[in-house]
Interface confidence: low
Amino acid sequence: LRLLDHRALVCSQPGLNCTVKNSTCLDDSWIHPRNLTPSSPKDLQIQLHFAHTQQGDLFPVAHIEWTLQTDASILYLEGAELSVLQLNTNERLCVKFQFLSMLQHHRKRWRFSFSHFVVDPGQEYEVTVHHLPKPIPDGDPNHQSKNFLVPDCEHARMKVTTPCMSSGSLWDPNITVETLEAHQLRVSFTLWNESTPYQVLLESFSDSENHSCFDVVKQIFAPRQEEFHQRANVTFTLSKFHWCCHHHVQVQPFFSSCLNDCLRHAVTVPCPVISNTTVPKPVADYIPLWEPRSGSSDYKDDDDKGSSHHHHHH
């Protein structure tokens, strides 16, 4: 969790002098309660926005917006604490709106916004706006919280953000899988325009999908420049057990921008429907999956199973 790196953060608006400060997420009013405290925010909204850094990188940000209730407690409102909690890591980041002048009633409802929290693809956050000073112990809460799920890199707008592009989101491997005779499976995919190694991982399951019965990994060495965007083929020799027929194939790149943490692409090949005239055929009904980033180095065991080769079609 971090703040977008550029432009002075502002919260001032006509009729209010305000400054944005870093916060420890523990406002002084927790420790030294006040007698008179403001009411809670109203209509908290969180939306996905996109913002450029000074370097020109594009990042997803949480756009946080809320309004004030139209009651006399705004006379005691000294500011607001904005807190963003990343749910999978319990990491929290806060900023504080510090009002340098007293709010007055005016004809329009007071409205505030902040768009500088950088968020990660596919992550869920809890966004909280606390009005300050915070309430006395056992006082009515004066905060509002909402959860916010950031789309992953498959989302059209997210795909072109810097974190997604760094993870390889622009690469479409267009994986195809073909069953061959002699218990073989041929995987083809399109190489990206970078001289980088790839791994193709095959894990096979029983028809019921609850029993992993075979796994193997093949390495593809970095292609030459003239092979960029060409198709690479890998042939796996499968388990001899006919029931070990549900195959999950992953292609993992090692792009320089994400190394061991690139987005993986995967296809699932279901067990064939048994009929009297079953012949080997290309698998047309594979299910494409967008795999999450994964800490690689955690490769599957190979045990020297299967035969491996790859070549590029020109």
Epitope: T89, P197, L259, K300, D304
Partner: antibody, heavy 118, light 107 residues
């Protein structure tokens, strides 16, 4: 120059806590998974923990599971190891190490010494 | 979990000798094996990765071979600066276990 510098080691009593830090420089830290490896006095290397570049995948050795927490702050180019419920057998030099694409760990820090003793 | 064993645990050889250290995995790990050299009081240094690929800057007298469960690190002509402890490490999946080490010194 690619560099890893560990800090935070020291003497702590059994049951106590310590937080190690590893400051990275000279490379794009946010693109790399990272590891902690330790070495008890006169003993061999023991892998302790792994964290992927975006903290999406984390692993621990059985010997530290439930007691140690690995984390990172990519904005600060820093790796951390929070060590709780420390035992005598956690006494070691702790190294942070960067994995190499293709395998192994090609960049190591100088290590920081943790001594657990009453 | 996969166990890694090394042999011998220590060896003494003369300058110029060919030295061989073996590492064995309790299950197949393909070629997901690295070798490290650690000199006394220093941090480990990567010598070989992917079982047989020499890390840049490492002298060519070092070589690695093997796949599956049995791996070998060879020093073709032992030099005084090669006195160190050598470790293998698997990295196919967590835990990324090291072997117990082989201590090499000069006769």
């Amino acid at each position: 120059e690619v560099q890893l510098v560990e800090s935070g080691g020291g003497l702590v009593q059994p049951g106590g806590s310590l937080r190690l830090s590893c400051a990275a420089s000279g490379f794009t830290f946010s693109s790399y998974s990272m590891n902690w490896v330790r070495q008890a006095p006169g003993k061999g290397l023991e892998w302790v923990s792994f964290i992927s570049a975006r903290s999406s995948t984390i692993y621990y050795a059985d010997s530290v599971k439930g007691r140690f927490t690995i984390s990172r702050d990519n904005a600060k180019n820093s790796l951390y190891l929070q060590m709780n419920s420390l035992r005598d057998e956690d006494t070691a030099v702790y190294y942070c190490a960067r994995p190499k694409v293709g395998g192994g760990m090609d960049v190591w820090g100088q290590g920081t010494t943790v001594t657990v003793s009453s | 979990d996969i166990q890694m064993t090394q042999s011998p645990s220590s060896l003494s050889a003369s300058v110029g000798d060919r030295v061989t250290i073996t590492c064995r995995a309790s299950q197949g790990i393909s070629n997901y094996l690295a070798w490290y050299q650690q000199k006394p009081g220093k941090f480990p240094e990567l010598l070989i990765y992917a079982a047989s690929t020499l890390q840049s800057g490492v002298p060519s007298r070092f070589s690695g071979s093997g796949s599956g469960t049995d791996f070998t690190l060879t020093i073709s002509s032992l030099q005084p600066e090669d006195v160190a402890t050598y470790y293998c490490q698997k990295y196919n999946r967590a835990p990324f276990t090291f072997g117990p080490g082989t201590k090499v010194d000069i006769k």
